[in-house]
Interface confidence: low
């Protein structure tokens, strides 16, 4: 009778019986695969045939008959060494070994390329006993080869102790080629060579590369894999493939796009973000960067005045983050903003220009040529002054601010006076007699108050003694300038 | 199987033109080159030039540039070879041929060979 | 271009005998761009070895091919009387591919 199991973990019982007599080498299976007529769905390998003395491990048994006839060595019969076979068809191969009955527990295991196969594998194996020996067949299929099923296999068994390898069994699984390496897209500079690599493989090898360009083949004749196709240089765009070829068919590469780096074009989307006085925050929106990453950009500046010089101010700043905040601009002015940005290659074209304002600021600079002097007569103290410069103004004058501090023993107290923008003189009633008094004026627009005049200070004396003597801003670099009356 | 079949022998007059076709088929007809070459009467085989029908790239034996055209016609897998001026030494018998390019350049398939007569 | 000489032009050969013919290059060939074709009464050439050594589907065991560098050799084992046909050399090496003279053979 014949046994069949699936392949499992769990030892295979081997019948035991009596063993009198020579082993039998070559057992006939009990049940047959026959193949319809003319179709053929798998490889199929019959391991038994007799033949010479296996040359891998062989176990000798101690174990001796009733009559002390030593037992010969147990080992695999020899089987097919190699199989050639074309990717998803099928394949059987097995090996097969005759065991002594003696031996109660024997597993037979499925290793490939030194791993045990475990799981969902079709091994099967098959008993075939008599009166002496089982013999033993171990059948491994599978339905559908891969590439991934490449390797070498063996069967092993363990007997007392003892392990029992067979000879490898080469399973060769062939196809189409397949790639290990494909071109890449890349971004090269104009008429400069650059090189593509193509890698595949079998079996069957050899495989053949060919190199084609925007759908036509470059190289007249194919190069083994791998092959590196060196192209001289471009000056347009061009689409890279490779072909390669074994005597299984052609297998194509994915198509790569090989780029000319360019100039960017121009930023587009200038925008103003934010306007103070002396400053504008812009963004952009960067152009195609000409397949070539930006590395810098420049913002150009021109004062929108047309009486201004048209000089250009230029900032420069790095590509990223699109921002960039112009700064030392005059208040309350119109400007053109254009913004270029630069690869490798080269700077774009300027974006279309924008017109942008800066918002009034606190004046710049202080009223000029500050002067004080007593008018005795009306108990009043005069201050005159000049307007700071138009353009230092940094928007419209509102009006002063006038800044007095009146000193004498031990009390000081200062006080703020607002004065319309039209004048340039101001009164102030005298507060205290026989102290001195500091004036400091800044001028103020919508934008704020600016910086006060350098103080000027006089002296106020007791009722009764007559001074017409003014005080004035000093020239430049006194830093506290006092008029002795 | 692959098999390459070519017209019928033609009989031309000195400056004249002739096409000659060839039809493939049991392979993919735009994997492989087709190339054409000539046998004069009682001489050797001489390779006039392949198209390699997936793009139409060509590539022409100078002897012939200028003179020779070869096409395909994809939907039927068929190639073509027209040659113009014809002179009395182009009296031959032209076959197609498939190239493998493993390596460059071997023809494994022969079409069975269109004899043109030039003659006034 | 590659000029391809084959020797001898024409032999005459009895059956069983063993038969040589050479294919001189004038450049040196890697000898996976060197083939040989026969070509029978009448008939197309036929490819008979690739690659300088490698038979061609369904050629007899008796055809081999050697060489290397400028020095290609075809040998018939033992011939039959249908290896009467020219036999030509070619090289796949460069454009224009070109082929040898030819080398006749006969059967006495």
């Known amino acids: 009778a014949i046994t069949e199991a699936r392949e499992e973990a769990k030892p295979y019982p081997l019948f035991p019986g009596p063993f009198p007599g020579s082993l039998q080498t070559d057992h006939t299976p009990l049940l047959s695969l026959p193949h319809a007529s003319g179709y053929q769905p798998a490889l199929m390998f019959s391991p038994t045939q007799p033949g010479r003395p296996h040359t891998g491990n062989v176990a000798i048994p101690q174990v001796t008959s009733v009559e002390s006839k030593p037992l010969p060595p147990l080992a695999f019969k020899h089987t097919v060494g190699h199989i050639i076979l074309s990717e998803h068809k099928g394949v059987k191969f097995n090996c097969s070994i005759s065991v002594p009955n003696i031996y109660q527990d024997t597993t037979i295991s499925w290793w490939k390329d030194g791993k045990e196969l475990l799981g969902a594998h079709h091994a099967i194996t098959q008993f075939y006993p008599d009166d002496e020996v089982t013999a033993i067949i171990a059948s491994f299929s599978i339905t559908s080869v891969q590439r991934s099923d490449n390797g070498s296999y063996i069967c092993k068994m363990k007997i007392n102790n003892e392990e029992i390898v067979s000879d490898p069994i080469y399973i060769e699984v062939q196809g189409l080629p397949h790639f290990t390496k494909q071109p890449e897209s890349m971004n090269v500079t104009r008429n400069t060579a650059f090189n593509l690599t193509c890698q595949a493989v079998g079996p069957p090898e050899p495989v053949n590369i060919f190199w084609v360009q925007n759908s036509s083949r470059v190289n007249e004749q194919p190069e083994k894999s791998p092959s590196v196709l060196t192209v001289p240089g471009l000056t347009e765009m061009a689409v890279f493939s490779c072909e390669a070829h074994n005597d299984k068919g052609l297998t194509v590469s994915k198509g790569v796009q090989i780029n000319i780096k360019a100039i960017p074009s121009p930023p587009t989307e200038v925008s103003i973000r934010n306007s103070t006085a002396h400053s504008i925050l812009i963004s952009w929106v960067p152009g195609f960067d000409g397949y070539s990453p930006f590395r810098n950009c420049s913002i150009q500046v021109k004062e929108a005045d047309p009486l201004s010089n048209g000089s250009v101010m230029i900032f420069n700043t790095s590509a990223l983050p699109h921002l960039y905040q112009i700064k030392q601009l005059q208040a309350l002015a119109n400007y053109s903003i254009g913004v270029s940005c630069m690869n490798e290659i080269g700077w774009s074209a300027v974006s279309p220009w924008i017109l942008a304002s800066t918002t009034e600021g606190a004046p710049s600079v202080a009223p000029l040529n500050v002067t004080v002097f007593l008018n005795e007569s009306s108990d009043n103290v005069d201050i005159r002054w000049m307007k700071p410069p138009t353009k230092q103004q940094d928007g419209e004058l509102v009006g002063y601010r006038i800044s007095h501090v009146w000193q004498s023993a031990g009390i000081s107290k200062e006080l703020l006076e607002e004065v319309g923008q039209n004048g340039s003189r101001a009164r102030i009633s005298v507060q205290v007699h026989n102290a001195t008094c500091t004036v400091r004026i800044a001028a103020v627009t919508r934008g704020g108050v600016g910086p006060f005049s350098d103080p000027v200070k006089i002296f106020i004396p007791a009722h009764g003694w007559v001074d017409y003597a003014p005080s004035s801003t000093p020239a430049p670099g006194n830093a506290d300038p006092v008029l002795i009356i | 199987q692959v098999q390459l079949v070519q017209s019928g022998a033609e009989v031309k007059k000195p400056g004249a033109s002739v096409k000659v076709s060839c039809k493939a088929s049991g392979y993919t007809f735009t994997t492989y080159d087709i190339n054409w070459v000539r046998q004069a009467p009682g001489q050797g085989l001489e390779w006039m030039g392949w198209i390699y029908p997936r793009d139409g790239y060509t590539k022409y034996n100078e002897k012939f540039k200028g003179r020779v055209t070869m096409t395909t016609d994809t939907s039927t897998s068929t190639a073509y070879m027209e040659l113009r001026s014809l002179r009395s030494d182009d009296t031959a018998v032209y076959y197609c041929?498939?190239?493998?390019?493993?390596?460059?350049?071997?023809?494994?398939?022969w079409g069975q060979g269109t004899t043109v007569t030039v003659s006034s | 271009e590659i000029v391809l000489t084959q020797s001898p032009d024409f032999q005459s050969v009895t059956p069983k005998e063993k038969v040589t013919i050479t294919c001189s290059a004038s450049s040196i060939i890697s000898s996976n761009y060197f083939h040989w074709y026969q070509q029978k009464p009448d008939q197309s050439p036929k490819l008979l070895i690739k690659r300088t050594s490698n038979l061609a589907s369904g050629v007899p065991s008796r055809f081999s091919g050697s060489g290397s560098g400028t020095d290609f050799t075809l040998t018939i084992n033992s011939l039959e009387a249908e290896d009467a046909a020219t036999y030509y050399c070619q090289q796949g090496r460069s454009v224009p591919l070109t082929f040898g003279q030819g080398t006749k053979l006969e059967i006495k």
């Open positions: 041929a498939r190239g493998y390019y493993d390596n460059l350049y071997y023809f494994d398939y």
